[in-house]
């Protein structure tokens, strides 16, 4: 029952497994399109290179049948029921492109000999680093380890002159695919994030979140959660806050900051805004169809996942390489390809790097501010405003862990 | 009036780092998008990165990874950190400012230009 890969003789093609449990509540036409887009620009970067070669994509839809419930906790075998469905079609192209969630993908990886490439926009757990043949082009779950250890650390700036060594970490179970999985790293003893920590404790319940912004014996000051500003107002509400509270709002797929008109609402006062840049080259971009800022990134990086496999297949072609080969199938990983937006790193173990933004609420202006960029590539945090208007005293980032003399906090009666 | 001074320039050995100041008059940093620009000798001027009003910094890929940019409003002086220089860095830098139509985004011109201050990597 041997599948033949539609990979040679001038014809090259990308499964796309098109399940109804993705990462993202994005229609499936959307990442249709992204695919479409993506073969358009691949068709003409070989055309412009002289390969005179045939590049397709074929959509392999999950009938939904038995995994209804759109929701990635409930996707273990789904990717498994659609390689099935290859292995009986008996066709495969050279590149596997799909799951998105960490589940399937774990699950696949787990029960197949993966001799081909597996590309996934999401696959955001722990449990999928560091696989030979998987390439993960949206932030996996490390790289948010290490920002938030680096930042943790990090004591010499004009605005952050203490490290931290405590965190409360808030996972109440309803969180998004991406948010789940990072918050799990988080939450996990033996990750890094845990490993370099003294404290470190995660709140399950709203009320545990609301009862630690005013605890005069809480043990840290320093909450992490994930999710959007509308995420955190449905928990905080305009509950007061003690004035030395830092919350980090994880947010990595966001681009809602980054429009013009976007007005900080006051609760977002305590809160430091973790997400990406919407592109930082200096050449602008026109990612033109028509996707709300949290849906963006999903299209792109399918998009992205197309371009990756166009350019791998150029090099392979224009140095008269095999395709089908473990060669082949290792080599998504440790390079630079000319993304959608500019250029797309991808670290030695196939994981995308990105450049994530730390963003505050200026007092002055209600409007969101960068205090910091950090590059996953070279775990380098690169400040930005040295001299931010912020809520806290003297406009700096308070200790981690209070001072226990007289109290100061604004009592809310 | 607005008005942009650079400083900082100077002669350093390939793999070495400078850092340069723009330092600025006339106007509010957070209304206003900033540009680093070079021009080497025989070449035309190049963006190396902007600095969008709201702090968001855009950078040409040949400087990606090694020059940074960061801004302090108390001094109304923007910086740019130059590190792993290498010999195709020569050239001068000049800052460039413009009022701010968008918060995230580069300008497609500037209206303000400093003098420049010159850059030499060499051993």
């Known amino acids: 029952s041997q599948v033949s890969q539609n990979c040679h003789n001038g014809s090259y093609e990308i499964s796309v497994l098109m399940m109804d449990n993705s990462a993202f509540a994005e229609p499936l036409e959307n990442v249709e399109d992204a695919v479409n887009e993506g073969l358009e620009i691949v068709r003409g970067r070989l055309q412009n290179a002289g390969l005179n070669v045939t590049v397709n994509a074929s959509f392999m839809y999950s009938d939904g049948l038995i995994h209804n419930s759109g929701d990635c906790r409930s996707s273990t075998c789904e990717g498994l029921d659609l390689l099935r469905k290859i292995s009986n079609a008996k066709r495969m192209g050279c590149v596997l492109m799909g799951p998105s969630c960490t589940y399937s993908t774990f699950q696949m990886y787990l029960d197949t000999e993966l001799s081909y490439p597996m590309i996934s926009a999401g696959s955001f757990g722990l449990s999928c680093d560091y696989k030979e043949t998987l390439t993960r082009l949206m932030s996996p779950a490390r790289k948010l380890t290490y920002f938030l250890v680096n930042f943790w650390k990090t004591n010499d700036l004009p605005f952050k002159t203490y490290s931290w060594s405590t965190s409360y970490v808030y996972k109440n179970g309803t969180e998004s695919e991406d948010c789940f999985w990072y918050l799990n790293a988080l939450e996990a003893s033996v990750s890094y994030f845990s490993h370099e920590l003294s404290f470190k404790l995660v709140l399950r319940q709203d009320k545990e979140f609301q009862d630690i912004l005013m605890d005069h014996n809480r043990k840290s000051n320093v909450i992490v959660m994930c999710g959007d500003p509308e995420f955190l107002y449905k928990l905080k509400g305009d509950r007061a806050v003690a004035e030395d509270i830092v919350i980090i709002l994880v947010d990595l797929f966001n681009d809602q900051y980054f429009e013009d008109n976007v007005t900080a609402p006051d609760y977002m006062k305590n809160v430091l805004v973790l997400t990406q840049s919407p592109g930082n080259s200096l050449l602008n971009s026109s990612f033109s169809r028509n996707l709300s800022p949290t849906k963006r990134d999903f299209a792109l990086a399918y998009l992205n996942g197309i371009l990756l496999f166009g350019h791998m297949l150029k090099t392979f072609l224009e140095n008269g390489e095999n395709i089908t080969t473990p060669k082949f199938a290792h080599a998504f990983r440790n390079l630079t390809f000319e993304g959608y937006d500019g250029p797309v790193t991808l670290d030695d173990w196939g994981d995308v790097d990105s450049t994530m933004v730390l963003l505050y609420t200026s007092v002055d202006t209600k409007k969101y501010k960068v205090l910091l960029t950090y590059d996953t590539h070279v775990n380098q945090t690169n400040p930005v405003d040295m001299s931010p208007t912020f809520t806290w005293k003297n406009s700096k980032l308070p200790n981690d862990i209070t001072d226990r003399g007289p109290q100061h906090h604004h009592h809310h009666h | 009036e607005v008005q942009l001074v650079e400083s900082g320039g100077g002669l350093v050995q390939p793999g070495g780092s400078l850092r340069l100041s723009c330092a600025t008059s006339?106007?509010?940093?957070?209304?206003?998008?900033i540009g680093w620009f070079r021009q080497a000798p025989g070449k035309e001027r190049e963006g190396v990165i902007c600095l969008t009003s709201g702090g968001l910094p855009k950078y040409a890929d040949s400087v990606k990874g090694r020059f940074t940019i960061s801004r302090d409003n108390s001094k109304n002086t923007l910086y740019l950190q130059m590190n792993s220089l290498r010999a195709e860095d020569t050239a001068v830098y000049y800052c460039a400012a413009s009022g701010a139509t968008s918060r995230w985004n580069c300008p497609p011109q500037y209206d303000h230009w400093g003098q420049g201050t010159m850059v030499t990597v060499s051993s």
């Open positions: 006339g106007f509010t940093l957070d209304d206003y998008a």
